[in-house]
Structures are given as C-alpha cells and as structure tokens.
Amino acid sequence: IQIPEEYEGHHVMEPPVITEQSPRRLVVFPTDDISLKCEASGKPEVQFRWTRDGVHFKPKEELGVTVYQSPHSGSFTITGNNSNFAQRFQGIYRCFASNKLGTAMSHEIRLMAEGAPKWPKETVKPVEVEEGESVVLPCNPPPSAEPLRIYWMNSKILHIKQDERVTMGQNGNLYFANVLTSDNHSDYICHAHFPGTRTIIQKEPIDLRVKATNSMIDRKPRLLFPTNSSSHLVALQGQPLVLECIAEGFPTPTIKWLRPSGPMPADRVTYQNHNKTLQLLKVGEEDDGEYRCLAENSLGSARHAYYVTVEAAPYWLHKPQSHLYGPGETARLDCQVQGRPQPEVTWRINGIPVEELAKDQKYRIQRGALILSNVQPSDTMVTQCEARNRHGLLLANAYIYVVQLPAKILTADNQTYMAVQGSTAYLLCKAFGAPVPSVQWLDEDGTTVLQDERFFPYANGTLGIRDLQANDTGRYFCLAANDQNNVTIMANLKVKDATQITQGPRSTIEKKGSRVTFTCQASFDPSLQPSITWRGDGRDLQELGDSDKYFIEDGRLVIHSLDYSDQGNYSCVASTELDVVESRAQLLVVGSPGPVPRLVLSDLHLLTQSQVRVSWSPAEDHNAPIEKYDIEFEDKEMAPEKWYSLGKVPGNQTSTTLKLSPYVHYTFRVTAINKYGPGEPSPVSETVVTPEAAPEKNPVDVKGEGNETTNMVITWKPLRWMDWNAPQVQYRVQWRPQGTRGPWQEQIVSDPFLVVSNTSTFVPYEIKVQAVNSQGKGPEPQVTIGYSGEDYPQAIPELEGIEILNSSAVLVKWRPVDLAQVKGHLRGYNVTYWREGSQRKHSKRHIHKDHVVVPANTTSVILSGLRPYSSYHLEVQAFNGRGSGPASEFTFSTPEGVPGHPEALHLECQSNTSLLLRWQPPLSHNGVLTGYVLSYHPLDEGGKGQLSFNLRDPELRTHNLTDLSPHLRYRFQLQATTKEGPGEAIVREGGTMALSGISDFGNISATAGENYSVVSWVPKEGQCNFRFHILFKALGEEKGGASLSPQYVSYNQSSYTQWDLQPDTDYEIHLFKERMFRHQMAVKTNGTGRVRLPPAGFATE
C-alpha cells in the first residue's frame, strides 16, 4: 500500500533509509583528512553504527575523529597528525542505520591510503644503439591507486615529438621503431603526474647514444608490444577497451586493425597514437571476439591477436522496492541481477545475513525473491539484497513496513456530479486504511445499488453508472469499513439531457474557387452552457482576422475561395461542460486538372518522316477523371504566342506519336481536360524543326471574276504557313478560255491573286492554281471555271400578273429573263413597291419604299403586310454582279379589310344603374367605316349572358347604357366595322357598384395665394359624379376660429377656388358629403404685398 497525501491526522513512522554515503572506493592522500559519510532518514530517529573489516568500529573512541552531531547523520572525519596516519585506518567500512522498525545498511566503503609517490633509486646506464635499430626507453613509474599521466621530455622541459616512428605506450615506455642519428640525446626524462596528490616526479635522465652507419638495413616489422603472438583480455561492459600494438622495423611500419569475428563498430571506435591504439567506447556483449593488429612495411608484416572476453559487474534487472503493507497482505521483494560471471546473491534482514537468523522465520526465498505471507505489524523490517562477482558488488535496501490504519474516505462529502443521459457517470469514493477497507454504495433507501446491472464498482471505490437515465438523479451513499472503523459520504447525481446534433453538416463536392456552407443544428440541456465549434481535419477552425477564408456564425461554417488544400473532413462539434458530440462531413474540391508537370520529346529521328513522339507525366485530376489531353503546338517563327491543337488523346494515355508538317518550328505543350474544363498547360517542350518538303496541298476557293468589264481577277485562299513545307511558298496560276483545248497561259506569283487583263465581257475560263516551293510543286491542281468581267443587264422582266390574295397580300409573277441579255451571272431580281395612298384620300406624306430580293431561279414573290384599301406601285429588275437592269412597272390596289380597334374607351358613371361610354374612332379604318358593335356581360358567374348592340352611325362617339345592376362589374367590348365586318376590339371592365359608393377624392391637395386657396383632386376613372360641401375654417385666437359659409361643389369639376380669405392665416379645410365628414386638410395663405390673382385655369363656383 501507499499512504495517500490526503490521509492526514495519523502519525506514521518511517523505517530507516540511507540517503547519502561515501563512494565504494576512497583513496586518501598523505595530507588529506579522512571523511566517511553515512546519512539516513527515518522516524523515530535513526541510530548509526560502523564496522571495519567486519568488526564493530566506534568512531567516537578513535583519536582525531570528529563525529557530526546531526539527527540524520552518522558521518565522521579523521584528521591526521602525520603523513602516514591514514595507513592505520585502511580497510572496508560499512555503516548501519537503525530505528525500531529495522536496520538499513550502506555499501562497503574501501578506504585506501596512498603514500607520497617516489621513484626508487636506480642507476640509469646509457643506451647504445646503432642507427636504424629499434630501442625501448623504460619508464616504470611507481604504483598508484589512482590513474597517473606520463610525459617524456628533455631537460629543457620540451616534449619529445611523437610520430609513427617514436611512440609512448600505455605503460609509459618510449618506443623507437628505428633510431636516427637525430635521436642522439642524453636527456630523455620520464615524468609521472599523480593528479590525486597534485605532484609530478621525474625519472633519472636516459642517455640515448646512436651510432651512425653507412648502410641502414631494411627489416620487416616485429611487435615490441605486445611481444607474444596473441593475448587474452577481459573487457568490462559499459567501460572503454583499449588495445595497443607498437612495432619496430625499417622502413617504419604502419598499423592496421581488423576484426575477423565481425564488423568494427565504426561509431564507437577511435584510433589514436598514429593508429597504434584502438579505443572502443562503452563495451557491449556484441564486442566479444578477436581483434587483430597488423604492422606492415615494404619487407613484410607482423601481427598480434587480442581475444577479448566481455564480462560485466553485477547490474540490476529488477531492484527490490520499499513498500507499505496492510495486515494480511503478502510482501514480495524481487532482487533480479545479471552480470558475467553470474553474481552470487545474498539476503540480509536488518543487516543480518539470513543464514545467521533463527530457522523459524516466516520468510521464504524463491527465484531471487524474498516472500512473506500474511504479514503483521511485527513483520516490519529492512531487507538487504547483495549481489557480487569478481568485478563488483551491488546492494539494495528495501523495507517491508506493515501498518494498521483506520478507514478514511478521502473524497469530499456531499459532492455533486453531473452527467448526460446515455453516458456513464463516475461517483468517486477514494477510501484508505490498513487493512484495505471494503467499499459499498447504497441508494437513498439504504439498499445496495449493485442489483441494477448498469451500476458497476471499481477497485478504487468509484461507482460507475452506465446508460444514465433521467430518474438516476438523486443521492447515493458510500460506506467504507475495515476492522477498526467505518465511514460514510454522500454523493449527489444530476442527470442532464444529452447534447444532440439534430442536423449535421452534409458531405459535398464543390468547385475550386466557389464557396461552401456547412450547417449544424444541435439541441442542448437548457441548464448547460452550449457551444458549437468547427474542426477541419482535426484542427479547430476560427475566423482569421486578416483573412475572410472562414465565416462562422449561428451554426454555419462558410469557406470562401475553395482551393484543393481545403479538401478534407469538416466536423461540427456541439459541446457543453458535460458532453461533446461531433458530426462529420467530407468536402471534395473539384475543378479543372492541374498542370501536366513534365513533357518530353522522343524518337526525334522520326522528324524526317514528319513525326515525333511526345510523352508527359499525368496531371492531378482534382477529383474529376481526366477525360483527354490536348496536344498543342506553337511556331515561334511564324506565329509566336499562337497555339494550335494537333489533337486530343484519351485521359488514360500519357504519350502519342504526332503527325507533323514539314518545315514547321514545333514547340509543344499538353493540357489535361476533365469535365470542369482544361487545366494549366505543361511547360513547353524543346523546339524541333521538321525538314523541308514539296507542298502537299494546293490553295482552295479558287475563283475567277472580273472587277471590270475587260478583266478577270483570279483569287484563292492562300496556303496557311504550316502547309508551306518550306520557308516560302509561291503560286503557279494557269488559265485558258473554256472549251478551246488550247495552250495554258501561266504565271508564278507570291500574292494570293492575279489580274488577267484585256478579256471580252463575261467569257468563261478554265483556271488552275498550284503551290510551289524550293522543294518542288504541290499535287496536280483541280480545274475551276471563272468568268471575265460583267456588264449591267439589258433584260427587262416581263410581268405575268398580280393575284390579290387578301386585303394585305398579293402574288406577283413574271417571266424568266433571257440570260444572254443579263451580261453576267443572273444573281436574282429586285422587287420594289410602295404605297401611293389610301383609296379614301391620297396623302402627300414621304413615300417609304420596300424591297424584296428574289433568287435567280424564282419568278414570283408574295408581298405581304400591305395596308388594306390602298394603292401600290411595283417595279421588278434583273441584277447581276455589276448591278440592276431596267425595271418593269405596275400598279395595284388592295381591297377593304376590317378596321383597327377604336381608340380610348372611357366609362363615366351617371347613376348607380347607368354608365356613359366615350370613345375615339380607330386610327386605321382599312375601308369605309359603317358603325360600331358594343358588347358587354357581367364578370361574375351568376350574371346575365352577353348583350350586343349594333351602333350603325360611324360618326358616333358616345353611348349611354342603362338598367345596369349596381352590384355587378361588367366587361365592355367595342369594335368598329366596315363592310368586311367588325375589327379588333377595345376592352374595359367596370360598373356602377364600386364607383357610386363612398366618394374617393384620390390625390387631393390645396395651394394658397394671399386671399384665396385652390383645392384640386383627380376624379377617379368611372367614379359617379356627386356633390359635396367644402368648409374653410380660420385658426388662431385673433381669428376666433371664424368659418366661411360652406360651399357646394361638384366632383367632376376637379378643383374649387375659395376667395375672400385673410392673408398670412392658417385654415383648416373640411369636406362633407350628405352631412358626413369625409376629409380634412390644412393650408396657409401668403402675407400681403403680392398680386391678388388666382392661378390661371382654375374654375370657381
């Protein structure tokens, strides 16, 4: 168990725990104090004791020992009185920290005393050697517990220069692979630096004497170190490994390192000392095996094999951990160690080896674990697990602390939990005690809640309630109990409505550049704070201040200017403080394809056959399959910036062989097309030019026609530059009179025309036009018939007659003209006609002429749209390319027709049963008017049928209708008549019903002069006439509200002028009908000094 921080009010003891201790190896130098450190925590206070070499050691009883008087410290310091006092205290120390709960133990602290370093006295003889031989200058420094550093210098304190030939070994010796006369010195001094004592001592100088020789003899390498052929080394895991090979020989050998057993770990290997030293960092198991050094020169080689065995000091696989236990639990301390060789593991309890304990103990040791079952407070102890092999020692202290604690609920009482329907609620009840208390949840009736399968308990005391329902709202009780006591808390649960997305966003496909709107509607519990946010591909979307990309408002997300990068999943997130629901929609952005990224020309040898192969990389389809690729070309020479399509290929194709034209400078591009249109084109290809060739086409649209009576102009459509097949093209024109079979006349021209002069009028010629370039002629051209120039026709069309079809159409016929008289190609006939006037009276207006062009193969025409009862003049002329010939003339008349509609029909109400109709005659009589036809019928279904009157007076302009129903609306229809019958009708709807009711003054207004006022109104169409009173009433104190006598006015008169008013006075105007007040308005007269005249055109009564 672990006592939670919140479990207060219980004073818990703590077993001892070592918090600080001296290192496992402590080297003390002559001038140093000895400090042995051991600190520990614990409650009650910890007592310390020491052992040296396994025997009880009492620091306080030793001379020169200072013990630290601190509750958590057993450390002490020994201060010496002479330089070798430390020798006396050498040994293996161990500290034990105890309180009533047990004893913790420190690791072994090996104390070593190092004396002042001295080189033993020795007589150093000179070293004599012949030039070219090898030599070793020994150093042999005194032994040291700490690593030391060796330097070779001369008497001037200058370092001896080291290189491939001269090297210092790891042992400090100076090796010469071969000596030179320049090595001859008497002061080779070895310096040893002891960092611990901060001292440097030096060996006696060595005198190296080199005898010169005339003939240096080459010799193959020999190893000076190591001297034998192989050696075995143990490397410690995690430590560095240093291998060394130093060779002699002449010329100076070079050193190489090999690993026959596997690859050299390049990331961890460094070569030093001119390759003589191999250092391998952080040795691992995989570094086990053979390493070889090879010393080589021009005469041969020498080698040494290092057999490396990787071993390891003990290390933890699983270190035992301290724990608190409640009564009755099983305690298990795992102590799993590894090492090479496999370490030996021993257990201690409270610092005493288990072998020395009484046999009736409860513990058992099983596969590296110490196990105690059914622990009780008396089983509290500190255990030690110790593992050792020849490379080291590993120690762990771990306590078993058995506590008895009353049950306590650590969750606050009377907490309120809120959750939504359908979700899971978690009511907390974190209880603690030793033994572990049992936890029970009860409802308000004290019944266990676990009868409902929706309620489920957790080991930590939490109660889960799944699939929450509204009626789960209420109070719940948690009861925690152990053998010492029991406690209860209450929890309130409130179940809220779940948030629901009632209408989520819909997946959609939109075009690039357009905008999309996603909508989202959600329902929330009214007591919760609602929120709707939007996410795009998992990241929150916000309106960005500097961009109008997103617009978010009222559950709407609008994304503007859609691009392909906007494609993805968009979700609406509806949330409250209790729940979150999400509805997702997919947006696909579609549009025309992306650019074709790459374009390559191949098979350029086919250019000689006017072909080439074009290949391209497929374009992005932007979610709409590519339907086709359009291959275009440009000729920068002939038509820069103009692209011509060479053809389209299916969208699944990415190459094609193109058929080209000779002598075109082709630059290609390819554009992908889908249903949304073409994409951006590819980058342009390189330019290729096809070889020249003779023309393959001749010009088309060859024509021969004169522009004068004595010539013929031969024209044709020039070849497009892409059909020239060469840098230039010319035209070979040939002609001869048709039917002569005589020789052809010919001319080669560059322009697209040729004028043949001195021809007879309108003679047919055979014509040929052929394309010619530097490579040859085009194919044999076709013969075209052309004609020399035309003259004006002399033929006059002979009229056959005119047939009157109806009052507004006639059929005109004539005989075909003599073609010989046409003097050219008969192009057709011009028919001109105009109205000379009505048969009623001839007008002197401007004459408008109409024209009809009739094709050459037609000799009749229908002239329609004529005015009835009118006289017309007619002319017919033949025409050719030169112009029109003489006209044949004729006049004709159209018969009477029916008239146009009468103009302006007005309805005037006479009474509630009678109406007066007023009208104007039609503009187009189309004959002699004989009168009018008036028809009317009620508009509603139940009215009487249609009534018609023939009004036989053509001069009639009004008609009074009586016996009308005041309750009905009528439809009135008036037609003028000629002898051909009634014409078009004018229609009005109305009646006396609406018009004779409450008076309507319409748009009524009043204006004023100095002593008068004019009231005017617009009588409503058809409104029955009536009479009413107008009363002017002066306002203001001095006027005394005086009224003028009311005046009687007729509705039809449109205005009324009131005289005798006071200047500069406000008047109220009242309108009465049958003593009923109908309307009121106000007016103010002008001040004096103006002309007293009423406005012109106003009637007064």
């Epitope: 191949s602 040898h605 400078h665």
Partner: antibody, heavy 119, light 107 residues
C-alpha cells in the same frame, strides 16, 4: 556575335558542391535552351541536362538526378549549373552550350570550366 | 539509354588521305545523328546533322552517311587542320549520348 562565357576553374573537396556560371551575349537569351555537357580528362562528352530560360523549366540526365540543379537568371542572361555531393570522378571540364533552335544539337559552346575534386 | 560506339578510337593518316570514322547506335535512331570536331584545347564544333547535312561553314571534304544504327563520317582528303577528336552524337531520344571519340592524327 554569339558568346557563352563561363566562370573560372574550381578545386573542391569530396562531399562539397560547385556552381558554374555561363553568361550569354549576342542573341536573345530566352529564345534558346542552354545545355550542360561535361568531359572527364581524356574521356568523351557526357550530357547532364538543360534549362529553358524563358520558363526556367529544367530536366536532367537520370545519372545526375538529385545532384544537379540548373538555373537561369534572365536579367543577367546567365545560366548556372550546381553539382553537389562531389566525388573524385566528377573531376572534368564542364561546358555550357546553346541548343540549336530546331534540334537538340550544340551550335555554340562556352570555353569550359575545369572542376577538380580532391581531398 | 542509347549507347554510341565509335571506332577506331584513334587513327593516323597522311595529308590527302581519305579517312572514315564509324559510329554504331545500340538501337534504331533513324538519321538523328550529328558529328562534332574538337581540336586540342578547344571546344567541340558542330560539323554534320541529320547524319548527312553539312552545318553552315563546314568544308565540303567532310560528309556523313548512314541510317538506323550504322553511321559514317568521311574526310575525303585529310588536311593538317583536320587534326582533332571527332565525336558522334544521337539526338533521337534523351538522354543525349555521345560516342567515345576518334582521335585523328597526321602521319
């Protein structure tokens, strides 16, 4: 008259990069593609790639893909060839050449730039 | 890639001799072959394209022939100024490839 003038000789370490320039004059720079060809000592010619100076579109021989970059600056009528991750076998004379207008031939050449790669 | 194999790699001839250099393509290249001349210390110069078309300014003693895979460059009468290395090049397909060169010397 048409001229292509290249930058001077370079000595480079393996693994480094070299950038050779080629300044064109005497014609409209954007009308003709620039190709790059190299010639190792005593060896034949090897095509490396091209650039279209009017669109800056470039393409390279598969062998050099990922190591070579050909660029152009219209304002100075200059093309550039950069070769990275140099190895000793990249020691060569590097030529820029103008592509003939109608065919992938080389009608005008730069004087060549010697690039030596050595440690 | 299309390989271009040139032979011989070098030749020595006297002034006035007729000299023939051949070039073989590893696949059909039609007549999309060009020949270049590179004088010692100089840049290559275009001589012939479309296998047989003489580039402007090239003396008429140079001629080319062949189609498909076998091509020939002929110098009808060798002159001292013709001492150079001659390269063939195919331009049917990318990458553009060159022959190894033929060094022509005067005896």
């Amino acid at each position: 008259q048409v001229q292509l003038v290249q930058s001077g000789a370079e000595v480079k370490k393996p693994g480094s990069s070299v950038k050779v320039s080629c300044k064109a004059s005497g014609y409209t720079f954007t009308n003709y593609w620039i190709q790059w060809v190299r010639q190792a000592p005593g060896q034949g010619l090897e095509w490396m790639g091209y650039i279209n100076p009017s669109t800056y579109y470039s393409d390279y021989a598969q062998k050099f893909q990922g190591r070579v970059t050909i660029t152009a600056d219209e304002s100075t009528s200059t093309a550039y060839m950069e070769l990275s991750s140099l190895r000793s076998e990249d020691t060569a004379v590097y030529y820029c050449a103008r592509r003939q207008f109608g065919l992938p031939l080389f009608d005008y050449w730069g004087q060549g730039t010697t690039v030596t790669v050595s440690s | 890639d299309i390989q271009m194999t040139q032979s011989p790699s070098s030749l020595s001839a006297s002034v006035g001799d007729r000299v023939t250099i051949t070039c073989r393509a590893s696949q059909d290249v039609g007549t999309a072959v060009a020949w270049y001349q590179q004088k010692p210390g100089k840049v290559p110069k275009l001589l012939i394209y479309w296998a047989s078309t003489l580039h402007s300014g090239v003396p008429s003693r140079f001629s080319g022939s062949g189609s498909g895979t076998d091509f020939t460059l002929t110098i009808s009468s060798l002159q001292p100024e013709d001492v150079a290395t001659y390269f063939c090049q195919q331009y049917s397909n990318y990458p553009l490839t060159f022959g190894g060169g033929t060094k022509v010397e005067i005896k």
